[in-house]
Interface confidence: medium
């Protein structure tokens, strides 16, 4: 059964952009106007979770790209990885808990939750040029991004 | 108060195709997934297959080739069909709402169909 | 096809605590719901998202879901308790309940 997919550009709220700097790792920079193109492109799914008000249960696929960004365990630290799946199988309803994030509107802005790991958040660094990791929220850590809906 | 009402042929005998339908009343037609389930008499649940308001089916792969399950909205109604009937496939057969509240899963079932196949 | 295990029957004295399991390949990778039915209804919701109640399901049940095994937990069992029980998951695009388990309240 088909599930219900949205494009988005998403920004840190200094505004860096998110580009795939190579296969399996995204960072955060400031782009300019003639590399603004290499921001990626999010395909959102709705997808199996517990919505609520503020919460809506998401994948965030790249769009053109058979990669989703998932959270797993490693060295006993929850971790944002890009995991490249079957295309023939994803996006799909119901998603692995691991690709599955709780999606938070705070007013203007918006929050990505691990579904699997609670209180762990798509966050980004204050410096430009790191990668994008999964964070708990603490310290200088940036976890509020704003999204730009793209045309399909 | 959401109700699923289904009905249809109770008896079949083997060879023929067995069809029933299921009725949604109260709540939002095209919101959710529409399920079919199945269980022989003494044993366990079987999932048959899910439509959703468009028309799209996920079917079980182990009775694709015989079945089908097609929505009617402006009645709000759905419908299985199983063709090529046999003694195994008596059982009583439930049609229930698959739910984004309770995660896609079945939080609002049918009475239940008894089918029997006999020759 | 994928298969969720469960133990055919479980016995609990009332008032202790009865626990069901289902077990799948990466079964904790997804996410795991239970039904109840007793004898002649239809199944009735009883945890889904692998531990989260539905409305008007009391507090004593409660689910777990890591590994390989969902866990369905009845605490301070009582008669009324006693009904088949099903996990139920699902598999890349099709669903599957385990075989059932029958909880018998001595």
């Known amino acids: 059964v088909p599930i219900r997919q949205l494009h988005y550009r998403l920004r840190d709220e200094q505004q860096k952009s998110l580009v795939l700097s190579d296969p399996y790792e995204l960072k955060a920079l400031h782009l300019n106007g003639q590399n603004i193109n290499q921001q990626v492109i999010f395909s959102m799914s709705f997808v199996q979770g517990e919505p609520s008000n503020d919460k809506i249960p998401v994948a965030l696929g790249l769009k053109g790209k058979n990669l989703y960004l998932s959270c797993v365990m490693k060295d006993g630290t929850p971790t944002l990885q890009l995991e490249s799946v079957d295309p023939k199988q994803y996006p799909k309803k119901k998603m692995e808990k691991r690709f599955v994030f709780n999606k938070i509107e705070v007013k203007s802005k918006v929050e990505f939750e691990s579904a699997e790991f609670p209180n762990w958040y798509i966050s980004t660094s204050q410096a430009e040029h790191k990668p994008v990791f999964l964070g708990n929220n603490s310290g200088q850590d940036i976890i509020d991004f704003t999204m730009e809906s793209v045309s399909s | 108060q959401v109700q699923l009402q289904q009905w249809g042929a109770g008896l079949l005998k083997p060879s023929e195709t067995l069809s029933l339908t299921c009725a949604v009343y109260g709540g939002s037609f095209s919101d959710y997934y529409w399920s079919w389930i199945r269980q022989p008499p003494g044993k366990g649940l079987e999932w048959i297959g899910e439509i959703d308001h468009s028309g799209s089916t996920n079917y079980n792969p182990s009775l694709k080739s015989r079945v089908t399950i097609s929505v009617d909205t402006s009645r709000n109604q759905f419908s299985l069909s199983l063709s090529s009937v046999t003694a195994a496939d008596t059982a009583v057969y439930y049609c229930?709402?698959?739910?984004?509240?309770?995660?896609?899963?079945?939080?609002?079932w049918g009475q239940g169909t008894l089918v029997t196949v006999s020759s | 096809q994928s298969v969720l295990t469960q133990p055919p029957s479980v016995s609990v004295s009332p008032g202790q605590t009865a626990s069901i399991t289902c077990s799948g390949d990466k079964l904790g990778d997804k996410f795991a719901f239970w039904y109840q039915q007793k004898p002649g209804q239809s199944p009735v919701l009883v945890i889904y998202?692998?531990?989260k109640r539905p409305s008007g399901i009391p507090e004593r049940f409660s689910g777990s879901n890591s590994g390989n095994t969902a866990t369905l937990t009845i605490s301070g069992t009582q008669a009324l308790d006693e009904a088949d029980y099903y996990c139920?998951?699902?598999?890349?695009?099709?669903?599957?309940f385990g075989g059932g388990t029958k909880l018998t309240v001595l």
């Open positions: 998202l692998d531990n």
């Open positions: 229930a709402r698959a739910s984004p509240s309770s995660g896609w899963t079945l939080d609002y």
């Open positions: 139920y998951a699902w598999a890349d695009t099709y669903e599957v």
